[in-house]
């Protein structure tokens, strides 16, 4: 058997650190057997069999010029083996961050904090954190650890499925290369890292007869669980074209009627989502949708709430083909005090 321990990495390659002493090991001989060392393709003897170092070659303060292939020969001139030297650095603790787009799963991503220049892999695992009380300390619940599957294999990302929203987890990401291993631990709670995906299907429609109104509607992001135990709340921003500043409102449900739009101007609208109990942070903004208030005259009498939702005679301007989901509750803004101002403006 070879006297050379096989480091993790390609076969026949041995590793060292720049500026440090490096020992190369002749793989095809018995430990302690004297050998001669040569650089591949070079006739000059680097170290003879009388060095007293047996099957090893010592390179003091290795640098990049020492990288390459070496040949070792036994006393009778037989090939003891070839060794390739690659220089690099031991692993440093990777940089790790975790994200959750829903309240049941989270993913963690990592990157090296220093480039080692060597073949590198990452071992990823996690466990549930539990602080045991005095009376319960003799019975530890199942807290792992479990592997955090890298998805897809080799990607700098692993995913934890079926996490508990109220629990805290510890993630272990260990960077491994032939010169060692280095671990980063990170404590994660879904409550703090939850950031929903932005709402989908944003549509902006005019309200016929109301030149200062736009109706915006949207749906939950597809990544949010189908039967949500946790609801989302929303934030809507709108602004007329060429206006730099956004107006912001927090709708009660999945639609909002804007009552102070600028007549005749296209308006950009976007929405963001957040857990309804303020866990985590707001999502990024949805792609903007555009709509222009109606230019027609108002109906002779102001319709009741239910009638306002009937299909208008004129096809509304729609940004997205997705149908709106009904609001979770009526919007009092539809018939608020601003209506009379709007009517006067239209009739004048």
């Amino acid at each position: 058997s070879s006297p050379c321990p096989q480091a993790w990495g390609p076969p026949g390659v041995q590793y060292g650190q720049p500026g440090r002493s490096v020992k190369l090991c002749c793989p095809g001989v018995t430990a302690g057997d004297p050998v001669s060392w040569f650089r591949d393709g070079e006739p000059k003897l680097l170290q003879g069999p009388d060095s007293g170092l047996g099957h090893e070659l010592v390179l003091a303060q290795a640098d990049s010029t020492d990288e390459g292939t070496y040949i070792c020969q036994t006393l009778d001139g037989a090939l003891g083996g070839t060794v390739t030297l690659q220089l690099g650095y031991p692993p440093a603790r990777p940089v790790v961050s975790c994200q959750a787009a829903d309240y049941e799963n989270f993913s963690c991503t990592w990157s090296p904090s220093q480039i080692s220049g060597l073949p590198t892999r990452y071992l990823t695992s996690y466990r549930k954190k539990t602080v045991l009380g005095a009376d319960s300390q003799r019975r530890s619940p199942s807290t792992g650890p479990w592997p955090c599957p890298q998805d897809p294999l080799g990607a700098a990302r692993c995913v934890v499925h079926g996490a508990e929203f109220w629990s805290q987890y510890r993630i272990n990401v260990t960077e491994v290369n032939p010169l060692g291993a280095s671990t980063r631990l990170l404590d994660v709670s879904l409550q703090s890292i939850l950031r929903p995906d932005p709402p989908q299907g944003l549509r902006v429609e005019s309200v016929p007869g109301y030149p200062r109104r736009l109706r915006a509607s949207w749906t939950y992001p597809a990544s949010w669980p189908c039967q949500p135990h946790f609801l989302l709340k929303f934030r809507l921003q709108y602004r007329p074209a060429q206006h730099p500043a956004w107006s912001t409102v927090e709708p009660a449900g999945l639609e909002e009627v804007i009552t102070d739009a600028v007549a005749g101007l296209p308006h950009a609208v976007r929405v963001s989502a957040r857990d309804f109990l303020d866990a985590g942070t707001w999502s990024t903004w949805s792609p903007e949708a555009w709509g222009t208030p109606s230019t027609g005259t108002i109906p002779k009498e102001i319709p009741a709430w239910g009638q306002l939702h009937t299909q208008p005679e004129v096809e509304p301007q729609v940004d997205s083909p997705a149908p709106p989901r009904p609001s979770l509750q009526p919007h009092p803004r539809l018939l608020d005090h601003r209506d009379s101002v709007e009517q006067v403006a239209v009739l004048a």
Epitope: V95, R127, T143, R170, N172, S182, T183, L185, L186, D187
Partner: antibody, heavy 126, light 111 residues
Framework: EVQLLESGGGLVQPGGSLRLSCAAS????????MGWVRQAPGKGLEWVSY????????GYADSVKGRFTISRDNSKNTLYLQMHSLRAEDTAVYYC???????????????????WGQGTMVTVSS | QSALTQPPSASGSPGQSVAISCTGT?????????VSWYQQHPGKAPKLLIY???KRPSGVPDRFSGSKAGNTASLTVSGLQAEDEADYYC???????????FGTGTKVTVL
């Protein structure tokens, strides 16, 4: 059953050395921060030393710095405290304890010891 | 690393409440939310009661509660019971050298 069992205590002369061991069972030792706490007879608790799960980082009370070394062997589920240059004031019951710790994206912090061993007595006397 | 300051003793009758203070500095108690409290009966190992200022581990009765204001943390034991007679210690992350620090200890007597 989650358990910590200390051993290695005894009587030692001033200037002498001793190595304490703490065998852990019932939990995944390699994931936890561990520490040593001592209590002199009739006195309060004194925080002695602390070690990260991988063993890469350690901490010591000023009173033992340079004399005591904490280490761990995760393959053996064992925590150690190597004590040199022992003094009379090191006489105490030494407890091994487990800590979940808290790890942010930049640092880990000592949090609270939730599991304690039964303690081992170290007496430094001539 | 100076020990955190606790009153040497506190007492109360069964059913009453008793509060124990733990005063440190902005480098320990005031600087981090890593304050814990322990109960120790004579001849026994300490037991964790409170961690991260206010959190109770599983199995610890809700009669024990923790709080913090500035550089001072407090443990309150309400509905005092005979078995609560013990020594109580606070502890905090020390802010340097990966170090922790304990309080001087408070002996609670149930009258």
């Amino acid at each position: 059953e989650v358990q910590l069992l200390e051993s290695g205590g005894g009587l030692v002369q001033p200037g002498g050395s001793l190595r304490l061991s703490c065998a852990a069972s019932g939990f995944t030792f390699s994931w936890y921060f561990m520490g040593w706490v001592r209590q002199a007879p009739g006195k309060g608790l004194e925080w002695v030393s602390y070690i990260y799960p991988s063993g890469g980082s350690t901490g010591y009370a000023d009173s033992v710095k340079g004399r005591f070394t904490i280490s761990r062997d995760n393959s053996k589920n064992t925590l150690y405290l190597q004590m040199h240059s022992l003094r009379a004031e090191d006489t105490a019951v030494y407890y091994c304890a487990r800590d979940e710790g808290y790890c942010s994206s930049t640092s880990c912090y000592f949090d609270a010891f939730d599991i304690w061993g039964q303690g081992t007595m170290v007496t430094v006397s001539s | 690393q100076s020990a955190l300051t606790q009153p040497p003793s506190a007492s109360g009758s069964p059913g009453q409440s008793v509060a124990i203070s733990c005063t440190g500095t902005s480098s320990d108690v005031g600087g981090y939310n890593f304050v814990s409290w322990y109960q120790q009966h004579p001849g026994k190992a300490p037991k964790l009661l409170i961690y991260e200022v206010t959190k109770r581990p599983s199995g610890v009765p809700d009669r024990f509660s923790g709080s913090k204001a500035g550089n001072t943390a407090s443990l309150t034991v309400s509905g005092l019971q005979a078995e609560d007679e013990a020594d109580y210690y606070c502890s905090s992350y020390g802010g340097s050298n990966n170090a922790g620090v304990f309080g001087t200890g408070t002996k609670v007597t149930v009258l």
